[in-house]
């Protein structure tokens, strides 16, 4: 069964290389599991970028080598993605499926385009 | 066109075991994820089990974890979902699905096949 995500269309990761964005489902129903992906677009290649499950009103748990962290509050989700560098700029697409109780939801939303700018080399002072 | 055929359905006691195999046809492709969901009949589509090619990542559902085992063999395009300690509860049509890319849901979807637990 299909569901909505909505997510902000433009974010711009910091000097730091971070992006922050909240991922926002319209649940049916009570879910009490939910799975989250993220993946990123680019030049018609569509790679995973980090995943992760949580129960309601938990924490997201990520694999412990993902760049991405977040946190949960009702049916939103917030995201931050770390160690961003412009190479990484791109569209990065939140996925979200209701995996418990039945009926299974899936939701795909329209993408992020996050810029990256790598921060210029600080100058040698004397 | 891609088409996805299950087999290894039955009846079986409570208890048994069973390996269901979902077989993809129709040109050479490397899914995105492959999965298992059931339907019982007069209840709602369960997910069942996934597994993302990408990282060889599986994901269970928690009434059939510690009992049910999905894997897949990419030479052969098949995915295998193998069902011990099986019980009445997980008597239901079992369909195999796939995704071409993480970004397409699951495309395409096998005809089902019936699992039937007796106790």
């Known amino acids: 069964k299909a569901m909505h995500v909505a997510q902000p269309a433009v974010v711009l990761a910091s000097s730091r290389g971070i992006a922050s964005f909240v991922c926002e489902y319209a649940s049916p129903g009570k879910a009490t599991e939910v799975r989250v992906t993220v993946l990123r677009q680019a030049d018609s290649q569509v790679t995973e970028v980090c995943a992760a499950t949580y129960m309601m009103g938990n924490e997201l748990t990520f694999l412990d080598d993902s760049i991405c962290t977040g946190t949960s509050s009702g049916n939103q989700v917030n995201l931050t993605i770390q160690g961003l560098r412009a190479m990484d700029t791109g569209l990065y697409i939140c996925k979200v499926e209701l995996m418990y109780p039945p009926p299974y939801y899936l939701g795909i939303g329209n993408g992020t385009q996050i810029y990256v700018i790598d921060p210029e080399p600080c100058p040698d002072s004397d | 066109e891609v088409q996805l055929v299950e087999s290894g359905g039955g009846v079986v006691q409570a208890g048994g075991s069973l390996r269901l195999s979902c077989a993809a046809s129709g040109g050479t492709f490397s899914f995105y994820g492959m999965g298992w969901f059931r339907q019982a009949p007069g209840k709602e589509q369960e997910f069942v089990a996934d597994?993302?090619?990408?990282?060889?990542?599986?994901y269970y559902a928690d009434s059939v974890k510690g009992r049910f085992t999905i894997s897949r063999d990419n030479a052969k395009n098949t995915v295998y979902l193998q069902m011990n300690s099986l019980k009445p509860e997980d008597t239901a049509v079992y369909y195999c699905?796939?995704?071409?890319?993480?970004?397409?849901?699951?495309?395409?979807w096998g005809q089902g096949t019936q699992v039937k637990v007796s106790s």
């Open positions: 699905a796939a995704e071409m890319s993480g970004i397409s849901g699951w495309d395409y």
């Open positions: 597994i993302r090619t990408s990282a060889g990542r599986t």
